[in-house]
Interface confidence: low
Amino acid sequence: LRLLDHRALVCSQPGLNCTVKNSTCLDDSWIHPRNLTPSSPKDLQIQLHFAHTQQGDLFPVAHIEWTLQTDASILYLEGAELSVLQLNTNERLCVRFEFLSKLRHHHRRWRFTFSHFVVDPDQEYEVTVHHLPKPIPDGDPNHQSKNFLVPDCEHARMKVTTPCMSSGSLWDPNITVETLDTQHLRVDFTLWNESTHYQILLTSFPHMENHSCFEHMHHIPAPRPEEFHQRSNVTLTLRNLKGCCRHQVQIQPFFSSCLNDCLRHSATVSCPEMPDTPEPIPDYMPLWEPRSGSSDYKDDDDKGSSHHHHHH
């Protein structure tokens, strides 16, 4: 969690002199409680916005917006504390709006916004706006909270953000998986425009079960520049285990921007429908032969073997 670094943070608006300050998330009104405290925020809204840093990087940000209730407590409102909690890590970041002038009622409802909390793809946050001073321990709460789920890098706008692009979001491998026979699976995918290696992770499951019955990892060496954006195909040899028929193929790239931490793409082949009358299984006839120059690989732990080739 961090704040976008691109410009001075502003909270002033006509009729209000205001400054944004870093906060420890423990406002001193907890420590020095005040008898008269403002009411809670109204209509807290959190939206996904996008903002550029000074360096030109594009990041997803939480756009926080709320209004004030139209009661006399605004006379005691000294500011607001904005808190963002990342739910999976318990990491919290806060800022404080400090009002340098007294609020007065005017013809429009007071409205505040803040769009500087940088958020991560595929993460959930709890956003809280506390009006300050905070209430005495037994007082009515004067905060409002909302959960906010950030889409993953598949989301159209997220895909072009710096964190997603660094993870390889622009690569669309367009994976196709085809069962050649009971023992062979063919995987086709589009290579990206970087000379880096890939791993194909095959996990097979019995029909309707989630415990794997076969796992196999296959290494694809880095393509040459003339092979960028070309289709590559691999034939994986399966373990001949009865009922081990649902195959999940995952492709892990190792792009320079994300290395071991790149976005993976997967495709699944379901078990075939059982025919009413069993048909004889034909002898294996390979539907694809490696051309000269391609390599044959055998997994070192003898779990299975694979062939791969890049199409030109």
């Epitope: 660094s166 970087e194 880096t196 060496p221 190792f254 994300c258 290395l259 071991n260 931490d261 690989y297």
Partner: antibody
Framework: EVQLVESGGGLVQPGGSLRLSCAAS????????MNWVRQAPGKGLEWVSF????????YYADSVKGRFTISRDNAKNSLYLQMNSLRDEDTAVYYC???????????WGQGTTVTVSS | DIQMTQSPSSLSASVGDRVTITCRAS??????LAWYQQKPGKFPELLIY???TLQSGVPSRFSGSGSGTDFTLTISSLQPEDVATYYC?????????FGPGTKVDIK
């Protein structure tokens, strides 16, 4: 210039704690996985720990598991190694190192020396 | 875990000699292997990655070969500045183990 600078080493008693830092500059730190590697006096290199770019994947050598914690602050371009319950055999020069696409580690710091002794 | 061994542990050769260091993995690691050079009192430097790809700036007298479990680092013509300890390292999956090292000096 791509650079890694370690700090935080020193003399500590067995059972004590130390926190090493590695300051990165000259490259987009937040896009790279990072490693700690150590070398005991007169001995070979020993890989200690790995953390991926977004801290989603972390690995430790068996010899330090449960005692050392790797972390990073991408906003500060910094890598850390929190070392607790230190033992005599943790005495070493500790290097932070950046992995290269395709493999290996192509950028290393100068190292910081940790001495565990009573 | 996969173990990495190197041989010889040390060697002495004359300037101009061809020097070969071998590294063996206890299980296959495809070509996920790197070689480093470490001079006394200095940090390690990457020489070779992906078993046989020369790191930029490294002299062409260094070369690497092998795949699976057996790998070789060759210095085609030993130079005085090549006096160092050489380490192999696997990086297919954690732990990213180093070999014990081979110390090379001049006769």
């Amino acid at each position: 210039e791509v650079q890694l600078v370690e700090s935080g080493g020193g003399l500590v008693q067995p059972g004590g704690s130390l926190r090493l830092s590695c300051a990165a500059s000259g490259f987009t730190f937040s896009s790279y996985s990072m490693n700690w590697v150590r070398q005991a006096p007169g001995k070979g290199l020993e890989w200690v720990s790995f953390i991926s770019a977004r801290s989603s994947t972390i690995y430790y050598a068996d010899s330090v598991k449960g005692r050392f914690t790797i972390s990073r602050d991408n906003a500060k371009n910094s890598l850390y190694l929190q070392m607790n319950s230190l033992r005599d055999e943790d005495t070493a020069v500790y290097y932070c190192a950046r992995p290269k696409v395709g493999g290996g580690m192509d950028v290393w710091g100068q190292g910081t020396t940790v001495t565990v002794s009573s | 875990d996969i173990q990495m061994t190197q041989s010889p542990s040390s060697l002495s050769a004359s300037v101009g000699d061809r020097v070969t260091i071998t590294c063996r993995a206890s299980q296959g690691i495809s070509n996920y292997l790197a070689w480093y050079q470490q001079k006394p009192g200095k940090f390690p430097e990457l020489l070779i990655y992906a078993a046989s790809t020369l790191q930029s700036g490294v002299p062409s007298r260094f070369s690497g070969s092998g795949s699976g479990t057996d790998f070789t680092l060759t210095i085609s013509s030993l130079q005085p500045e090549d006096v160092a300890t050489y380490y192999c390292q696997k990086y297919n999956r954690a732990p990213f183990t180093f070999g014990p090292g081979t110390k090379v000096d001049i006769k």
